[in-house]
Amino acid sequence: TIPPHVQKSVNNDMIVTDNNGAVKFPQLCKFCDVRFSTCDNQKSCMSNCSITSICEKPQEVCVAVWRKNDENITLETVCHDPKLPYHDFILEDAASPKCIMKEKKKPGETFFMCSCSSDECNDNIIFSEEYNTSNPDLLLVIFQ
């Protein structure tokens, strides 16, 4: 997708729905493209992106991409259509309400990516698999 300052006029009258028949409307996502980041060796990080965009299309989801090489760390935040690959990878977790980072194989760098479908969900990127649970007892163990 494209950030709001260069958005085109679109008028798609089709109502987009999810698998349960719920109406999908344009989502709110953090949208700072690529920025240098200090996020490293943490269970989760905030994006520190102050730009919240209304995604261009109802089917788009929030995406975050974390990359580390010998020189720097960057965090990319965008809206993207999960039917299309991003950085040559399928957005397999697009229906998740939280942005749970998954490592991807990229030569010469450490590369993590997540996608999610709740408003501004790419503001909080989660590296620890412990967060990926709906078990309250487990959460008690994590945070005690």
Epitope: P4, D18, A22, F25, L28, I54, S117, S118, E120
Partner: antibody, heavy 116, light 107 residues
Framework: QVQLVESGGGLVEPGGSLRLSCAAS????????MSWVRQAPGKGLEWVGR??????????DFAAPVKGRFTISRDDSKNTLYLQMNSLKTEDTAVYYC???????WGQGTLVTVSS | DIQMTQSPSSLSASVGDRVTITCRAS??????LNWYQQKPGKAPKLLIY???SLQSGVPSRFSGSGSGTDFTLTISSLQPEDFATYYC?????????FGQGTKVEIK
């Protein structure tokens, strides 16, 4: 289709309290930031406040005239948004709309009248 | 808070006229601007978001332009159902503030 239905409005004396509800259906409520916007009789639109998704911490923000008096909460299990209004003033008289934050869906509004 | 100023506050026009409403922000808001239409006794309806993106189902005679501090809503050929009040709203920062409204009346 998407529906937002407000309830709980009515006549209340200055200094009193009222709780508005907004029942949401037709979309994944838990995934959406929600807002309240009000409109005094014959006046323009005024943003009241918002609540973010529980996934992003459920943080709330308020307009200066209502800060400290109004609170917003949500019950994702009931697909319901709430606006708790305390220490009401005559200038809070308005139609209150529940809205999907910054987007196209609004409720029909509920009238709150603060008068002695 | 960012102040939004609309002009004119009201205008009279005839069916078929081209109508332009302007909205000025007190500081740069990039393209974070929405336009709403409201008819008496009804909830506002979103017409344009992100300054120029037409909301699904909105007729193409409505268009939005601008960035930074100056924005325009244009109705290329006014129709009977377009007589209403129009509001701009910035979504660049909290609180998201509205303009005072522009009432479009029948001449």
């Amino acid at each position: 289709q998407v529906q937002l239905v407000e309830s709980g409005g009515g006549l209340v004396e200055p200094g009193g309290s009222l709780r508005l509800s907004c029942a949401a259906s037709g979309f994944t409520f838990s995934n959406a930031h929600m807002s309240w916007v009000r409109q005094a009789p014959g006046k323009g639109l005024e943003w009241v406040g918002r609540i973010k998704t529980t996934y992003s911490g459920g943080a709330t923000d308020f307009a200066a005239p209502v800060k400290g008096r109004f609170t917003i909460s949500r019950d994702d299990s009931k697909n319901t948004l709430y606006l708790q209004m305390n220490s009401l003033k005559t200038e809070d008289t308005a139609v209150y709309y529940c809205t999907l934050d910054l987007r196209q869906y609004w409720g029909q509004g509920t009238l709150v009248t603060v008068s002695s | 808070d960012i102040q939004m100023t609309q002009s004119p506050s009201s205008l009279s026009a005839s069916v078929g006229d081209r109508v332009t409403i302007t909205c000025r922000a007190s500081q740069s808001i990039s393209s974070y601007l929405n336009w709403y239409q409201q008819k008496p006794g009804k909830a506002p309806k979103l017409l344009i978001y992100a300054a120029s993106s037409l909301q699904s189902g909105v007729p193409s005679r409505f268009s939005g332009s601008g960035s930074g501090t100056d924005f325009t809503l244009t109705i290329s050929s006014l129709q009977p159902e377009d007589f209403a009040t129009y509001y701009c709203q910035q979504s660049y920062s909290t609180p998201p503030t509205f303009g005072q409204g522009t009432k479009v009346e029948i001449k």
